[in-house]
Interface confidence: low
């Protein structure tokens, strides 16, 4: 009579997900090892029939309406290793009437998230769990943790407490968890970490609290193992004192209120002068710290969305392993990395959306930098070789600045221009919205760009040969919104070009693509095209996938190539229903509705169709 149970059974795994069940089925194979009953309407868990399935190792009871656990309900499940009771109603009194979950001798992972559990009640629910490695209490209503909260679980390694309302963690709350390595306390209501002393902890997530200060315990010989610390979305006013955490690899401090000090520390003894924010800086290590160089192993530092106005030299000095530094959305007016060997491993530097006016990058600094994001600043008169000095630079975003590109080596630009030629590593460059008036010949010579965006520079004049040297490398070119009437670019020579954006100009002619090229997407929206003759477009037929044409004064006749694309569909032309064309009488119709005979009236024979 097993066929009466609508569960799916494969080997020793049984899935009864979302079947509207009101109770645990009693007719499943007794040797079932994995049982998924999630998403049903179970209200109580009784020792019978659950106790029949003594071979169970995995039991998922999540997303039900469980408010009653019969004492000893799990007692017979002596092999049980993974138990999920997430998203039920265990906070209701009947769930805890006698002994809660009871002992769980072999359970290694237990999920009690989303049960509205509150402090005090939790202690009654948790029983002895000597093998427990992973415990989730996320999305509950816990307000405090005491010494008694986590007793009898000596093997616990991972503890998830995110999305509670924790305001208070009693001293010694985690003392009974000697193996704890991962602790998630994000999305709580903590205001201060004044005595962090969990030496064995490796990962600590404190994001989305209201923390104003983070201080490690003052144990001179302490060897903290912490490698990953997330403090984003808090209320830190200063860079925390992390000198006791020499193994930190990942540090996220974004979305705080951090300012870095602008002068030397008032207190010459070291790192404790809170008035100036120097408690904030990892300038010297405590005497007992073996490495002697705090943050020397840090790979990833996120300081975005803070209130930093200046980066002191001493701050960058110790970050010798740093690969990723995010300083976007701060108040920086200047950034300097001039010293030989400054940030030697840095691969990505995000300085976007600050108020940068000056940028000084030394000839041998930032030797590993691949990505530099500078969009949304006020950069204007930069030293000409600012970017040419960056030996590994591959991607550069300068959108929304006021940078003027120099010409090629034989075509020097005006004072204050920046050289973009001869940067042999550079692949992607955005100069969108820089008020560039003239793009000089040879501007990108010996810089094998694959992507170049010059959009939103109204009035831009592209000199003959301005894109010279890019013919064999360029794959994406955008010249949108520049008011161009003619294009001084021999497009068919760009043999690798896949995407071309010429929208929002005043173009009426394109060069003839007579031989097959690589172009896949062509955006000609809002220009002045009336004809796209087959003689010019023929070479695109094999490669072109999408063509954007709305907002052009297209002629209904003489556009046979375009009509053929609409009907045969080799090229996906946008909005085919609404692509409007005009007859000489100024009558407007949908181009897809034009018939050959419409163009023969009055001698308007459509020779291309």
């Amino acid at each position: 009579h097993q066929d009466k149970v609508p569960c799916k059974m494969v080997d020793k795994k049984v899935s009864c997900q979302v079947l509207g069940l009101l109770q645990v089925p009693s007719v499943l194979p007794p040797d079932t090892e994995t049982l998924d009953l999630s998403g049903n309407q179970l209200r109580s868990i009784l020792a019978s029939p659950l106790g029949f399935y003594t071979a169970l190792r995995h039991l998922d009871l999540s997303t039900n309406e469980i408010s009653f656990l019969q004492p000893g309900a799990f007692q017979a499940l002596t092999h049980l290793e993974h138990l999920s009771l997430a998203h039920n109603r265990l906070a209701m009194a009947t769930a805890l009437s006698a002994g809660g979950l009871g002992p769980l001798p072999r359970v290694t992972s237990l999920d009690l998230s989303g049960n509205s559990l509150y402090s005090g009640l939790l202690e009654r629910l948790l029983g002895e769990a000597p093998s427990l490695h992973t415990l989730s209490l996320a999305e509950n209503s816990l307000t405090r943790l005491t010494r008694h909260t986590f007793r009898d679980m000596p093997a616990l390694e991972q503890l998830d407490l995110h999305s509670n309302v924790l305001m208070d963690i009693e001293d010694g709350a985690f003392e009974g968890l000697p193996r704890l390595t991962h602790l998630n306390l994000s999305r709580n209501s903590l205001t201060c970490i004044s005595d962090f002393s969990l030496q064995q902890l490796r990962v600590l997530d404190l994001s989305c609290n209201s923390i104003e200060a983070f201080q490690t315990a003052s144990q001179p010989q302490a060897e903290f193992q912490l490698t990953w610390l997330d403090l984003r979305e808090n209320k830190l006013l200063h860079f925390p004192d992390l000198a006791a955490l020499p193994r930190l690899i990942y540090l996220n401090l974004s979305n705080n209120l951090i300012r870095l000090p602008t002068g030397p520390p008032q207190d010459s003894k070291g790192i404790h002068a809170p008035s100036e924010g120097w408690s904030a800086l990892p300038l010297s290590a405590p005497s007992g710290n073996a490495s002697g160089r705090p943050l020397s192993q840090l790979l990833n530092l996120d300081l975005s969305y803070n209130e930093i106005e200046l980066i002191p030299d001493s701050f960058l000095e110790h970050l010798t392993s740093l690969c990723f530094l995010n300083l976007s959305r701060n108040c920086l007016r200047t950034f300097e990395a001039r010293r030989l060997g400054s940030l030697p491993c840095l691969m990505l530097l995000d300085l976007s959306h600050n108020a940068l006016e000056t940028l000084e990058l030394g000839a041998r600094a930032l030797g590993s930098l691949r990505t530099l994001l500078l969009q949304g600043n006020a950069l204007r008169d930069l030293p000409p070789y600012t970017f040419a000095n960056l030996a590994s630079l591959q991607r550069l975003n300068l959108q929304g600045n006021r940078v003027s590109p120099c010409g090629g080596p034989d075509e020097p630009g005006p004072s204050g221009c920046v050289a973009f030629s001869g940067i042999t590593s550079l692949r992607s460059l955005s100069l969108v919205d820089n008020e560039i008036e003239l793009l000089r010949a040879g501007a990108f010579l010996h810089t094998p760009l694959t992507e170049l965006d010059l959009s939103s520079n109204p009035g831009l004049e592209v000199a003959t040969g301005a894109l010279g040297g890019l013919e064999a490398s360029l794959e994406v070119l955008a010249l949108q919104g520049n008011g161009l009437m003619v294009l001084q670019v021999d497009l068919p020579c760009f043999i690798c070009l896949k995407r071309l954006n010429l929208a929002e100009n005043r173009l009426s002619h394109l060069p003839a693509w007579t031989q097959a090229v690589s172009l896949e997407v062509l955006d000609l929206r809002n220009n002045s095209f009336s004809l796209l003759p087959g003689s010019a477009m023929g070479g695109l037929e094999t490669s072109l996938r999408r063509l954007y044409l709305q907002g052009n004064p297209l002629s209904c006749c003489g556009n046979g190539w375009l009509a053929a694309q609409l009907h045969q569909g080799r090229v996906d032309v946008d909005a085919t229903q609404d692509l409007i064309c005009r007859f000489s009488s100024q009558e407007e119709v949908s181009l897809s509705h034009v018939r050959p005979e419409d163009c023969e009236k009055g001698g308007l024979k459509n020779i291309n169709l």
Epitope: D453, A478, G481, G483, A503
Partner: antibody, heavy 120, light 107 residues
């Protein structure tokens, strides 16, 4: 910072013409498209029209015969005229900036809306 | 015109819960989908563009996904301030079209 502000009459007689103005600051109309979108009481959003950064115009085909969108770049203003108003044109009218380059039209900043009631 | 079908029309979720809203386009929109949130008496706010890119300043509990004609908005660990109406919009081509909206309430 980027802002858009709609202004208009509030109350319009049936069969009359509605004139709305969207005044923008923090960006240039020659760099970004601007759209008009409306929302009748307790209903969803309906796109009305867009004027592109190059001055091109796009209209909702169901309303096109009654619409006109224009702009004055020197005053940073976009105008919408809608003729022959009926009671079903009662709605909150928003103007919004369209962001980004590429092939997607996304409204990243919206005005607070102008309430328009069509009633005699 | 591209039709956008949004579901469900209304949805209630508990604090901390994960909720998902679906949006289906009548044709392939090549990830040209945006999601907006609107609170009573306020204008819509952009949450997600390009199907999965988070707009600056939007909390990371919001995420978007999908391709072709099927897209979704997921809110993990729902907060009180997430109550409101959510709209999808295709931004591939004119006429721009919106989904009918999903009203999200706290249980």
């Amino acid at each position: 910072q980027v802002q858009l502000r709609e202004s208009g009459p509030g109350l319009v007689q049936p069969s009359q013409t509605l004139s709305l103005t969207c005044t923008v600051s923090g960006f240039s109309l020659t760099s970004f498209h601007v759209s008009w979108v409306r929302q009748p009481p307790e209903k969803g959003l309906e796109w009305i029209a867009t004027i592109s950064s190059g001055g091109g115009t796009y209209y909702n085909s169901a309303l096109k015969s009654r619409l006109s969108i224009s702009r004055d770049t020197s005053k940073s203003q976009v105008f919408l005229k809608m003729s022959t108003l009926q009671t079903e044109d009662t709605a909150m009218y928003f103007c919004a900036r369209i962001s980004g380059w590429g092939h997607y039209y996304v409204m990243d900043v919206w005005g607070q809306g102008a309430s328009v009631t069509v009633s005699s | 015109d591209i039709q956008m079908t949004q579901s469900p029309a209304s949805l209630s979720g508990s604090l901390g819960e994960t909720v998902t809203i679906q949006c289906q386009a009548s044709e392939d929109i090549y990830s040209g989908l945006a999601w907006y949130q609107q609170k009573p008496g306020k204008s819509p706010q952009l949450l997600i563009y390009g199907a999965g890119s988070l707009q600056d300043g939007v909390p990371s509990r919001f995420s978007g996904g999908g391709s072709g004609t099927h897209y979704s908005l997921k809110i993990s660990s729902m907060q009180t301030e997430d109550e409101g109406v959510y709209f999808c919009q295709q931004g591939l081509k004119f006429p721009l079209t919106f989904g009918s909206g999903t009203k999200l309430e706290i249980k």
